[in-house]
């Protein structure tokens, strides 16, 4: 299962940590995808490492752990964020976070 804070808030110009927690007795995590709506933010692969989408490379920092640190937030960053955990065996698990960016 995926456990996450469903709603988080942060100030404009500040930063926020996007974090999902996956727990399973049988499946191991092989890859985690992070998306803003349908747009790819970053991917972590246990074997291949991190990939951060070029459009976000100046504002998205991998970590902590399998999460992301989103910096220099703007009001336009308000919205839904999705983590997708690829596991082996066991398939795909998804989590959702709503980020509200507030005026500073």
């Amino acid at each position: 299962t995926i456990d996450t804070k469903r709603n988080i808030s942060a100030e404009e110009g500040g930063s926020v940590i996007l974090q999902c927690h996956f727990s399973s007795d049988t499946a191991e995590v092989t890859q985690v995808d992070w998306k803003q709506q349908d747009q790819l933010l970053a991917i972590y692969s246990v074997d291949l490492g991190w990939h951060v989408a070029s459009v976000f490379s100046d504002r998205v920092v991998p970590g902590p752990s399998l999460g992301l640190t989103f910096q220099s937030l703007t009001m336009n960053d308000t919205g839904e964020y999705f983590c997708t955990y690829h596991t082996y065996p066991g398939g795909i698990y998804k989590g959702r976070i709503f980020l509200k960016v507030q005026e500073s």
Partner: antibody, heavy 125, light 107 residues
């Protein structure tokens, strides 16, 4: 540019274990972040993924073959290998080794970027 | 496991014409789709990854499109060297799976 070369016996008897090796040249297998994969193709048929091993040492196998397959890496020889036990005639195929993930860091996608030329293995008594 | 279905099984096209090959996934694979070309007696060659990005050295006449469950490989003007079998493949997740292939033959 990495290159791959499969080697192993072309004929295996039913119920025995098929053993193939893929030798990597043009780079070190231990310093590369890829998946090292085996794929096969029975005569006149399509491609079937057998399994992969990652740089973390994790192995991933086709569920239909999982009970019979072992993939391992020998970094000292710059090789990775496939063992398929209890073979039958249906395991007769061209066996390819391949590298997956060369474009991951730039684009976030994985595909079988580099292939060996393949080796034909026939299972027959 | 995700099942990949290609159509048609065989496509007869005249040189210089356009060829359109389809690939359908049994569930969404986002843009995690690759296309390969295989000629008789040869290993497959990567053409397209990420559904639409051409691999190094692949001519511009090859283009890929689609996302989710429906994908297309288009060869804008078939050359003699393009007559071959084409496979689609999804990844991730595990297990990696290939479509059954489309044979593009000379009409």
């Amino acid at each position: 540019q990495l290159q791959l070369q499969e080697s192993g016996p072309g004929l295996v008897k039913p119920s025995e274990t098929l053993s193939l090796t893929c030798t990597v040249s043009g780079g070190s297998i231990s310093s590369s972040r890829y998946y090292w994969a085996w794929i096969r193709q029975p005569p006149g048929k399509g491609l079937e993924w057998i399994g992969s091993i990652g740089t973390s040492g994790s192995t991933y196998y086709n569920p239909s073959l999982k009970s019979r397959v072992t993939i391992s890496v020998d970094t000292s020889k710059n090789q990775f290998s496939l063992k398929l036990s209890s073979v039958t005639a249906t395991d007769t195929a061209v066996y390819y080794c391949a590298i997956e993930g060369a474009n991951f860091r730039d684009f976030g996608y994985v595909a079988f970027d580099i292939w060996g030329q393949g080796t034909m293995v026939t299972v027959s008594s | 496991e995700i099942v990949m279905t290609q159509s048609p099984a065989t496509l007869s096209v005249s040189p210089g014409e356009r060829a359109t090959l389809s690939c359908r996934a049994s569930q969404s694979v986002s843009s995690n789709l690759a296309w390969y070309q295989q000629k008789p007696g040869q290993a497959p060659r990567l053409l397209i990854y990420g559904a639409s990005t051409r691999a190094t050295g692949i001519p511009a006449r090859f283009s890929g499109s689609g996302s989710g469950t429906e994908f297309t490989l288009t060869i804008s003007s078939l050359q003699s060297e393009d007559f071959a079998v084409y496979y689609c493949q999804q990844s991730p997740p595990w297990p990696r799976t290939f479509g059954g292939g489309t044979k593009v033959e000379i009409k």
